[in-house]
Interface confidence: medium
């Protein structure tokens, strides 16, 4: 059947895809949607209850932030 990603495995995969950038379990409001009233899509809905690939996971990485020196 389709591969699903849940729980700690989901967090681990997000860390792989997003690196230390961080991630959200819900897309920021309005992300990828033109409708202000569109229901917020969660990564558990998309990747645990259904299947998703690494590119889909990338959509839940934290948005860009100003670069800082190490």
């Amino acid at each position: 059947g389709p591969e699903t990603l849940c729980g700690a495995e989901l967090v681990d995969a997000l860390q792989f895809v997003c690196g230390d950038r961080g991630f959200y379990f819900n897309k920021p409001t309005g992300y990828g949607s033109s409708s202000r009233r569109a229901p917020q899509t969660g990564i558990v809905d998309e990747c645990c209850f259904r299947s998703c690939d690494l590119r889909r996971l990338e959509m839940y990485c934290a948005p860009l932030k100003p670069a800082k020196s190490a």
Partner: antibody, heavy 115, light 104 residues
Framework: QVELVESGGGLVQPGGSLRLSCAAS????????MSWVRQAPGKGLEWVSY????????GYADSVKGRFTISRDNSKNTLYLQMNSLRAEDTAVYYC????????WGQGTLVTVSS | DIVLTQPPSVSGAPGQRVTISCTGS????????VHWYQQLPGTAPKLLIY???KRPSGVPDRFSGSKSGTSASLAITGLQSEDEADYYC?????FGGGTKLTVL
């Protein structure tokens, strides 16, 4: 100490298949995601595939999607890469690497695709 | 797609300091942490620096990493002949093209 040992490489004709293995020891195998990374002769590193630590999720580079399958056997501490429909451009040394930062690597196994 | 650019080669004399750059964009290096790998001739890669500037245990403090803006750098001080190797930067699952370090 952490040890990753790849095997299964060899010479195969275009269109053929090969199955690589990576035997792990020295760490809690079932706690780490794993990846395969390859290196064509004289070239740089290219990530190939990822598998979550329980094995329920996999990811692939576009260049191998639909042809390669990653899997793991957590009872044997072993990672696999089933490679089908091999092409000349798949010729490379294949490494298994641990975790999300690739903190440990195996010694590699050479796959040569040639007629 | 993410592209990380490294110089193909750098060189230095024993005892010198050399730096290897890794350039991307604000949407990758500017946002993600960078890791560095060392690959000695004929051997597998080894994690050298992770999360921009952290050294795994066993890596000499002659090796250091930094990140500023859209570029990351690996610095090697007190260059030694055994440092001659290929060096790769990476963010998540993407690698730079690699830099060959020659010790003169």
């Amino acid at each position: 100490q952490v040890e990753l040992v790849e095997s299964g490489g060899g010479l195969v004709q275009p269109g053929g298949s090969l199955r690589l293995s990576c035997a792990a020891s020295g760490f809690t195998w079932s706690s780490f995601a794993m990846s395969w990374v390859r290196q064509a002769p004289g070239k740089g590193l290219e990530w190939v595939s990822y598998i979550s630590y329980l094995g329920s999720y996999t990811g692939y580079a576009d260049s191998v999607k639909g042809r390669f399958t990653i899997s793991r056997d957590n009872s044997k501490n072993t990672l696999y890469l089933q490679m089908n429909s091999l092409r000349a451009e798949d010729t490379a040394v294949y490494y298994c690497a641990r975790g999300t930062k690739f903190d440990y690597w195996g010694q590699g196994t050479l796959v040569t695709v040639s007629s | 797609d993410i592209v990380l650019t490294q110089p193909p080669s750098v060189s230095g004399a024993p005892g010198q300091r050399v730096t290897i750059s890794c350039t991307g964009s604000s949407s990758n290096i500017g946002t993600y942490d960078v890791h560095w790998y060392q690959q000695l001739p004929g051997t597998a890669p080894k994690l050298l620096i992770y999360s921009n500037s952290k050294r795994p245990s066993g890596v000499p403090d002659r090796f250091s990493g930094s990140k500023s803006g859209t570029s990351a750098s690996l610095a090697i001080t007190g260059l030694q002949s055994e440092d001659e190797a290929d060096y790769y930067c990476s963010i998540t699952r993407v690698f730079g093209g690699g830099t060959k370090l020659t010790v003169l």
